[in-house]
């Protein structure tokens, strides 16, 4: 039977998870390398397409699942493969940090990717000033 609950990841939830896994970390996933991506081409799907190739790394599993859920909501989900930079690889932690920076920018400037994001927009200034207080 269908669930009476249909959650989708909110931007604040994704931001918090990205902060949690990068805070005080010099590396992630044993320094695994992934393809660099153009996040402006659809940040959730682009990031997912790169990170999905990282296996056996529990630290990013929750992020991967959030991105998968967010990407599946996007009508143009299949149009981002050509945007990947095939000649540049970066460490997982760098991609995640890039994503965090980009998500914060999207959040601040109102380039919303979903209905839930609209309701969270008013909170961006708080996030920018308090993200270092997040618990682990």
């Amino acid at each position: 039977s269908p669930s009476p609950v249909t959650p989708s990841p909110t931007l604040k939830e994704l931001i918090e998870e990205l902060v949690n896994i990068t805070q005080n970390q010099a590396s992630l996933c044993n320094g695994s390398m992934v393809w660099s991506v153009n996040l402006t081409a659809g940040m959730y799907c682009a990031a997912l397409e790169s990170l999905i190739n990282v296996s056996d790394c529990s630290a990013i599993q929750r992020t991967q699942r959030m991105l998968k859920a967010l990407c599946s909501q996007k009508p143009a989900a299949g149009q981002i493969s050509s945007e990947r930079s095939r000649d540049t690889k970066i460490e997982v932690i760098q991609l995640v940090k890039n994503l965090l920076t980009y998500v914060r920018g999207v959040y601040r400037h109102g380039n919303f990717r979903g209905l839930n994001d609209i309701f969270e927009a008013q909170k961006i200034e708080w996030h920018e000033h308090h993200h270092h207080h997040h618990h682990h």
């Epitope: 669930s3 609950v5 249909t6 939830e13 918090e16 599993q61 859920a69 997040h134």
Partner: antibody, heavy 120, light 107 residues
Framework: EVQLVESGGDSVRPGGSLRLSCVAS????????MGWVRQAPGKGLQWVAW????????SYADAVKGRFTISRDNAKDTLYLQMDDLRVDDTAVYYC?????????????WGQGTLVTVSS | SYVLTQPPSVTVPLRQTARISCGGD??????VHWYQQKPGQAPVLIIY???NRPTGIPERFSGSNSGNMATLTIRGALAEDEADYYC?????????FGSGTQLTVLG
């Protein structure tokens, strides 16, 4: 109709072991993260453990880490909680619960619980 | 570890508005969920992701989350709303529950 039915609760001495089971029906069990939550008599809810849909990741509350093991058999639509080195303060009703998010966030359906009593 | 603080009890007259608070450090950055539990029964999800109501939950239940406080509001509380209420967030790689609030409806 979604149903979660726990079993395996019993009275046991401190240091003993128990294995709880939770049989799921009414939904595709293999697509959902699952968890265990307990409630000591007259007390509040305390999360115990969770497991991803395919079993690829687990996590435990500090109070049970190293003593309890959560697992699942998707072919049998069953969730398990192996409880070893039981202590008096593990006495509680243990609920099996389903998380409707794929990433881990909340519980939307709960079983009716099974009582575990640890006493000397 | 992350701690959610709730008042032990809240009392409200019949058909008046009850508000149950849930405090946590920067709770605004988290999605807050609320459960209702009646004696001898399993908990029931009544609000998820701060303010969303699951199918079948009456409109008198609503939720909000701002500052360091999330709030469950019951407008026009009924006798059947007498129960324990728990807030919950995701933190520390797991599900964190508040200590619970016992709601009493007078009249």
């Amino acid at each position: 109709e979604v149903q979660l039915v726990e079993s395996g609760g019993d009275s046991v001495r401190p240091g003993g072991s128990l294995r709880l089971s939770c049989v799921a029906s009414g939904f595709t069990f293999s697509r959902y993260n699952m968890g265990w939550v307990r409630q000591a008599p007259g007390k509040g809810l305390q999360w115990v453990a969770w497991i991803y849909d395919g079993g690829s990741r687990t996590s435990y509350a500090d109070a049970v880490k190293g003593r309890f093991t959560i697992s699942r058999d998707n072919a049998k639509d069953t969730l398990y909680l192996q409880m070893d080195d039981l202590r008096v303060d593990d006495t509680a009703v243990y609920y099996c619960a389903r998380d409707p998010s794929s990433w881990g966030s909340l519980f939307d359906y709960w079983g009716q619980g099974t009582l575990v009593t640890v006493s000397s | 570890s992350y701690v959610l603080t709730q008042p032990p009890s809240v009392t409200v007259p019949l058909r008046q508005t009850a508000r149950i608070s849930c405090g946590g450090d920067n709770i605004r950055s988290k999605n807050v969920h609320w459960y209702q539990q009646k004696p001898g029964q399993a908990p029931v999800l009544i609000i998820y992701q701060d303010s969303n109501r699951p199918t079948g939950i009456p409109e008198r239940f609503s939720g909000s989350n701002s500052g360091n406080m999330a709030t469950l509001t019951i407008r026009g509380a009924l006798a059947e709303d007498e129960a324990d209420y728990y807030c919950q967030v995701w933190a520390n790689d797991g599900y964190v529950f508040g200590s619970g609030t016992q709601l009493t409806v007078l009249g």
